[in-house]
């Protein structure tokens, strides 16, 4: 007769491994027990548990309510024991030493291999601002047996960089995420892509890219400056900029105060009907937590009694 | 015939210490485990020590570890007890018996001894 | 320890009768379990291993059952010479513990 085993059982983490030892004998032959033990290199042998055909299953202490057979039906020539629940400590060299009448013992060794899935974790890099160079956008970690695969799937231009972490029983695989921060990231996702034999399926944590930045400022509602002329109604300022966080508008009069009636919306200004006293040089100031940006206009409204032609000048300054 | 034969028993004093023996007969002595089973007066039975075929493993049982020493002497086919620090609580027949099958953990005695008694008391 | 339950702690029987005497374990001993029957002023005798197995030389009047935790003596029956005092003993785990023992009388 021979035993019938595996070369190596691969279990998850929390699941029950399957130990088989199966002796193929001949005719009339009998198993009278099957003990399994663990036998790791440089360590005396472990019992684990005896499959006494008369006595039945014996477990143990230190593996007491972890060992069981398979459920029935059983044959008797079959040795195999169920490890309940697995933890990585489980993992290592199994050994079934099977005795039989009359052919005597056999024994096979088989190795337990535990994976241990990873549980990834996503950390953010600093503050990416528009302007900077090569920047740590993220940094992905994952730990597990055997070590899993770390991996970037995102539209954004990038480079990555992983380093490898071994302890005794698992490894740790940190990637780093770096880019040059532009405005156009923003709202782009990168994600983090963790592969291991103990996952049905890769695990993806996804982070969304906020990159700050302020655009420059300008200022419309002069473009036909005939427009501007004394009793107009309706006539507005409006400051355009773009930027993340979104930007505040605060208008102010560079050479006096805003005039009466001039009514502040946001990054409008709003004038009452044109008189000559709502001309002057007007600054829409933008900022955010980022940066700031300034642009000025020079308002000349026109008295239509006047021959002389409206003169307006746009001054953009940051 | 299988025949196990206690001795050594009888009347001591609280602290006193006394070797009980069993000669075995009718078997290879070698092939087997041995234990010790006691029964107080009027009470059940309790099982008070076991040794290992070549003497090289031993148990006891909480009530008299560190007082009592299991041993054997295989070349003349006999087992002992060696009780110390003896109490009332000791007091019982005490019977040397036979294991079925050799193994580190349980068995069951398939031959018992007639039993002797031992008395503590002052 | 694990300990062992019997019941009864006695019974009184007549001659012929079939009479069953279970013992529980406080935890699972598979078929760990071994049936003595002592009669007084004598040595214990095995009569059951492996919770099921007649010992050589037992009459076949005797048999046992049950696993894990419980577990029976039958005795189809009852002789004169069955009246005595009956043990089941585990032998799972160290140290190896007896039931309180179940004492069989006529009635």
């Known amino acids: 007769g021979e035993l019938e085993t595996s070369d190596v059982v691969t279990v998850v983490l929390g699941q029950d491994a399957k130990l088989p030892c199966f002796y193929r004998g001949d005719s009339g032959e009998q198993v009278g027990q099957v003990a399994w033990a663990r036998v790791d290199a440089g360590e005396g042998a472990q019992e684990l548990a005896l499959l006494h055909s008369k006595y039945g299953l014996h477990v143990s202490p230190a593996y007491e309510g972890r060992v069981e057979q398979p459920p029935p039906p059983r044959n008797p020539l079959d040795g195999s024991v169920l490890l309940r629940n697995a933890v990585q400590a489980d993992e290592g060299e199994y050994e079934c030493r099977v005795s039989t009448f009359p052919a005597g013992s056999f024994q096979a060794r088989l190795r337990l291999r535990v994976l241990v899935p990873p549980l990834p974790s996503l950390n953010p890099g600093p503050a990416l601002e528009e302007g900077q160079g090569l920047t740590l956008a993220a940094s992905c970690t994952a730990e597990g047996s055997p070590a899993p695969s770390v991996t970037w799937d995102t539209e954004v231009k990038g480079t990555t960089s992983s380093r490898s972490f071994k302890h005794s029983r698992s490894a740790a695989v940190t990637s780093e995420f770096h880019l040059v921060p532009s405005r156009s990231m923003n709202g782009q996702p990168l994600t983090c892509v963790v592969s291991h034999p103990g996952l049905l399926q890769d695990q993806r944590i996804t982070h969304i890219l906020h990159v700050s930045f302020l655009a420059e400022a300008s200022v419309r509602g002069l473009e036909d400056q005939n427009l501007w002329h004394i009793g107009r109604e309706g006539a507005m300022l409006k400051c355009l900029s773009e930027g993340q966080p979104p930007p505040s508008y605060n208008w102010t009069r560079l050479d006096g105060p805003l005039p009466s009636g001039v009514r502040v919306d946001g990054d409008t200004l709003g004038f009452p009907p044109l008189t000559t006293e709502h001309s002057g040089i007007y600054v829409c100031h933008v900022s955010n937590e980022f940066s700031s940006r300034d642009s000025q206009v020079t308002v000349d409204v026109l008295d239509p009694q006047e021959d002389s032609g409206k003169q307006v000048d746009l001054v953009s300054a940051s | 015939e299988v025949q196990l034969v206690e001795s050594g028993g009888g009347l001591v004093q609280p602290g006193g210490s006394l070797r009980l023996s069993c000669a075995a007969s009718?078997?290879?002595?070698?092939?087997?485990?041995m234990s010790w089973v006691r029964q107080a007066p009027g009470k059940g039975l309790e099982w008070v020590s076991r040794?290992?075929?070549?003497?090289?493993?031993?148990d006891y049982a909480d009530s008299v570890k560190g007082r009592f020493t299991i041993s054997r002497d295989n070349s003349k086919n006999t087992l002992y007890l060696q009780m110390n620090s003896l109490r009332a609580e000791d007091t019982a027949v005490y019977y040397c018996?036979?294991?079925?099958?050799?193994?580190?953990?349980?068995?069951?005695?398939?031959?018992w001894g007639q039993g002797t008694l031992v008395t503590v008391s002052s | 320890d694990i300990q062992m339950t019997q019941s009864p702690s006695s019974l009184s029987a007549s001659v012929g009768d079939r009479v069953t005497i279970t013992c529980r374990a406080s935890?699972?001993?598979?078929?760990?379990l071994a049936w003595y029957q002592q009669k007084p002023g004598k040595a214990p005798k095995l009569l059951i291993y492996?919770?099921?197995s007649l010992q050589s030389g037992v009459p076949s009047r005797f048999s046992g059952s049950g696993s894990g935790t419980d577990f029976t003596l039958t005795i189809s029956s009852l002789q004169p010479e069955d009246f005595a005092t009956y043990y089941c003993?585990?032998?799972?785990?160290?140290?190896?513990?007896f039931g309180q023992g179940t004492k069989v009388e006529i009635k």
């Open positions: 040794i290992s075929q070549s003497g090289g493993t031993n």
């Open positions: 009718g078997y290879i002595f070698t092939n087997y485990a």
């Open positions: 003993q585990q032998h799972y785990t160290t140290p190896p513990t």
């Open positions: 935890q699972g001993i598979s078929s760990y």
């Open positions: 018996a036979r294991q079925t099958e050799d193994r580190s953990y349980g068995y069951d005695l398939d031959y």
């Open positions: 492996a919770a099921s």
